[in-house]
């Protein structure tokens, strides 16, 4: 029961996390313009991974996508890649984990298969969460670096007909959404991995071993057993040791001089 609850909770937490990663990736508020020391306080600029937006105090908002792919900073491209990888891995993980849920029965799927699928999805969620956290952190680092560089260059002169305005960007809402979502996906993945351990079959297989007495066809079956654990459990009645002992599944052989009582 605890295993099912852990697995189910892990799935739900990961689902919320991945939804958050998708939301963060699509959001425009990755960086917001710090309006301190800005001449036009009525205009507010915020930028995302895919487009830039301008909002005015009047309520007017205009958003436009970035033109070039090659002209954009390498760091921004890296963040885009990390977020997309996180979403893809998370989506695959969700798909795998649906079939791995203990409460869902699909044909004659064994617990060992479900355990493997739970572990796989758990690892995928962990990597997905790490990708999201890494992506958001790289972007945040880029903002912090740019912020201090901008502060240093704040009072540059006119510089001819075109002057670069040292606008300072600060953390947008998407960064916090991304960090929380990545963390949730990571936690969900860990929970799935924990649930996997409980799903792994820890069977005690009682082997019925046939002993053949010389000249008799009576099979004596003692209560010998072998406990096995883990994925590699001896689920089929295989030969445990050589000698006169045969498993019940094996064909009865004729008595030989090597058989003993």
């Amino acid at each position: 029961m605890a295993v099912t609850a852990c697995q189910g909770l892990g799935f739900v937490v990961s689902l919320i996390g991945i939804a958050g990663i998708i939301a963060a990736t699509c959001m425009d508020q990755w960086s917001t313009q710090d309006l301190y020391n800005n001449p036009v306080t009525a205009v507010f600029n915020y930028q995302g991974l895919w487009r830039s937006c301008v909002r005015e105090s009047s309520g007017f908002t205009e958003c436009r996508g970035y033109f070039t792919l090659l002209g954009l900073p390498a760091m921004l491209q890296a963040v885009r890649a990390l977020m997309i990888v996180g979403i893809v891995l998370g989506a695959i993980g969700l798909l795998v984990s649906i079939f791995a849920l203990k409460c869902i029965r699909i044909g004659s799927m064994e617990d060992s298969a479900k355990a493997n699928m739970t572990l796989t999805s758990g690892i995928m969620f962990i990597v997905s969460g790490l990708c999201a956290i890494a992506g958001v952190s790289v972007f945040a680092n880029m903002l912090v670096t740019n912020f201090w560089m901008s502060t240093a260059n704040m009072y540059t002169g006119m510089g001819g007909m075109v002057q670069t305005v040292q606008t300072r960007y600060t953390f947008g809402a998407a960064l916090f959404v991304g960090w929380v979502a990545g963390g949730l996906t990571l936690i969900g993945g860990v929970m799935m991995c924990i649930a996997c351990r409980g799903l792994a079959p820890e069977e005690t297989n009682y082997k019925a071993v046939s002993y053949h007495a010389s000249g008799h066809s009576v099979a004596y079956k003692p209560g010998g057993f072998k406990a096995s654990t883990g994925f590699g459990s001896n689920t089929k009645n295989k030969k445990i040791y050589d000698g006169g002992a045969r498993t019940e599944d094996e064909v009865q052989s004729y008595p030989s001089k090597h058989d003993y009582v």
Partner: nanobody
């Protein structure tokens, strides 16, 4: 590259009117604000009037009620209608545009300037 071409300056009598025009060309994400600044001989450059993409305008106290700024976003032009001109308004008028050029790249683009002389 973004470029601004301003025009419409000249000599005018006190109390007269003049219309300044400015056209922007090039590629950008957002033309955040367009406006006019002026610089009188021996003085600092000062804001005259500014207008945002949404049409919100702001004026210097000295020109309020006399000057009117308007903008055509489709043609990327800004015009400054100057009425009841005074000799104090004599200056070189510069067109300005604040542009979001690309990802976290904001530019202040300036026109070459047009001289307005108001005679008493």
């Amino acid at each position: 590259a973004v470029q601004l071409v301003d025009s419409g300056g000249g000599l005018v009598q006190a109390g007269g009117s003049l219309r300044l025009s400015c056209a922007a060309s090039g590629i950008w994400l957002h033309m955040v604000t367009m406006g006019w600044y002026r610089q009188a001989p021996g003085k600092q450059r000062e804001l005259v009037a500014i207008i945002t993409s949404g049409g919100s305008a702001d004026y210097a106290d000295s020109v309020k009620g006399r000057f009117a700024i308007s903008r055509d976003n489709t043609k990327n032009t800004v015009t400054l209608q100057m009425n009841s001109l005074k000799p104090d308004d004599t200056a070189v008028y510069f067109c300005n545009a604040r542009v979001v050029a690309d990802f976290q790249k904001v530019l202040d683009v300036w026109g070459q300037g047009t001289l307005v002389t108001v005679s008493s």
